[in-house]
C-alpha cells in the first residue's frame, strides 16, 4: 500500500561533511516495526546509504558501521549522514517502510539535494 | 503507568449477548493495536483476533467470526467486545492484551460465564 | 492456520536444575521482513500472562537472565538455566508472524 514520505527540497551540508533534515511520513497508526532506508540517486542509478529498523518501544539504531545516525519521534526521522565529500553531492530519497504489524505500506520522499562543499585549504602560513 | 483495566464480565443465558471492555490509559491509544485472548475453564490461550485502533478495523480468529464483534470509542480510550447468541462453551476469562511486536500489557481478565 | 505444538505438556523440576520447553510451529514463521515474530509467556493460576522473550531469543526488560529462548524456522526452544521456586506456573509460545497469530496449547511446570 502506498503512503506519503515528506522531505526538505535542499540542504546544504556543513564544512565538516555532516547533513541533516527530517523525514516525515503519513501517520504510522498502530505501526511497530518500522524500516527508513536513505538512498542516493545519482543519474538514473540509485544506491542504499545506510538503512535502519526501530519499533515504538525502541530508539533508531543504525549499524555502528553506518555512515547514518537517526532519531524518531512519531511520524518523524531525523536523519545525519556524516563524511560526506563534495562528490557526495546529490538527491537523497527517504523511503519508509512500516513493516509490522500488516498491512505493509511503503513511501517514497521526492529527495533532498544535498550540497556538499569541500573546505578550501588552508594556505600555508610564513 | 500504562493500564488496561477490563470490566463487563457476568453470567449469561444461552443465547444471550454481552458487552465487555477494557479500559486503557498511560499511553496513547491509537498508537498501538489491542487484542482480544480467550481462556476457557482450566485450557490454554486462544487468540481471538485484535483491532487497529488508527483505522478501527478488525481481524479475526476463524473460530470468532461472525458472533464477536470488536470496536472502539477512541474518546474514551476503550476497546469493546461484543459478544452474541452465546453458548456454554464461550464460558472463559476474556483478556485484552496491547501489541507492538509482542503484548507486554495485559487487562486483568474479566470471566464470562454461559449457564442456563 | 499454523499449529503450535509444546512439549512436553508438564515437566517436574527441582530448584537450581534446567528446565526446557519445546515449540513447534506447523509451517516456517519467518515473516515476510525476515523477522520472526515468536514470544513466550509465562501464566500463573488466576493471573494475566506475562511476556519473558519476544523475537525468538530477546529477553524482555526485568526478566532473569535465567530465562533465554533460542531457534529457528518451525523449532524453538524456552531455557531456564536454573529453575526457582517463583518459576511454577504454565508458560505458552506464541506466533504473531503469520494471521491468525496463534498460541501453543502451553507447558506446565512444577516445581518439586
Known amino acids: 500500500k502506498g503512503m506519503h514520505a515528506a522531505q526538505p527540497a535542499v540542504v546544504l551540508a556543513s564544512s565538516r561533511g555532516v547533513a541533516s533534515f527530517v523525514c516525515e511520513y503519513g501517520s504510522s497508526g498502530n505501526a511497530a516495526e518500522v524500516r527508513v532506508t536513505m538512498l542516493r540517486q545519482a543519474g538514473s542509478q540509485m544506491t542504499e546509504v545506510c538503512a535502519a529498523t526501530y519499533t515504538v518501544e525502541d530508539e533508531l539504531a543504525f549499524l555502528d558501521d553506518s555512515t547514518c545516525t537517526g532519531t524518531s519521534s512519531g511520524n518523524k526521522v531525523n536523519l545525519t549522514i556524516q563524511g560526506l565529500r563534495a562528490m557526495g553531492t546529490g538527491l537523497y530519497i527517504c523511503k519508509v517502510e512500516l513493516m509490522y504489524p500488516p498491512p505493509y505500506y511503503v513511501g517514497m520522499g521526492n529527495g533532498t539535494q544535498i550540497y556538499v562543499i569541500d573546505p578550501e585549504p588552508c594556505p600555508d602560513s610564513d | 503507568e500504562i493500564q488496561l483495566v477490563q470490566s463487563g464480565g457476568d453470567l449469561v443465558k444461552p443465547g444471550g449477548s454481552l458487552r465487555l471492555s477494557c479500559k486503557a490509559s498511560?499511553?496513547?491509544?491509537?498508537?498501538?493495536?489491542m487484542n482480544w485472548v480467550r481462556q476457557a475453564p482450566g485450557k490454554g490461550l486462544q487468540w481471538m483476533g485484535w483491532i487497529n485502533t488508527y483505522t478501527g478495523e478488525p481481524t479475526y480468529a476463524d473460530d470468532f467470526k461472525g458472533r464477536f464483534t470488536f470496536s472502539l470509542d477512541n474518546a474514551k480510550n476503550t476497546l469493546y467486545l461484543q459478544m452474541n447468541s452465546l453458548r456454554a462453551e464461550d464460558t472463559a476469562v476474556y483478556f485484552c492484551a496491547r501489541r507492538s511486536i509482542y503484548y507486554p500489557y495485559w487487562g486483568q481478565g474479566t470471566t464470562l460465564t454461559v449457564s442456563s | 492456520d499454523i499449529v503450535m505444538t509444546q512439549t512436553p505438556l508438564s515437566l517436574s523440576v527441582s530448584p537450581g536444575e534446567p528446565a526446557s520447553i519445546s515449540c513447534r510451529s506447523s509451517?516456517?514463521?519467518?515473516?515476510?521482513?525476515?523477522?520472526?515474530?515468536l514470544e513466550w509467556y509465562q501464566q500463573k493460576p488466576g493471573q494475566s500472562p506475562k511476556l519473558l522473550i519476544y523475537k525468538v531469543s530477546n529477553r524482555f526488560s526485568g526478566v532473569p537472565d535465567r530465562f533465554s529462548g533460542s531457534g529457528s524456522g518451525t523449532d524453538f526452544t524456552l531455557r531456564i538455566s536454573r529453575v526457582e521456586a517463583d518459576d511454577a506456573g504454565v508458560y505458552y509460545c506464541f506466533q504473531g508472524s503469520h494471521v491468525p497469530w496463534t498460541f501453543g496449547g502451553g507447558t506446565k511446570l512444577e516445581i518439586k
Open positions: 509451517q516456517s514463521i519467518v515473516y515476510s521482513n525476515g523477522n520472526t515474530y
Open positions: 498511560g499511553y496513547t491509544f491509537t498508537n498501538y493495536g
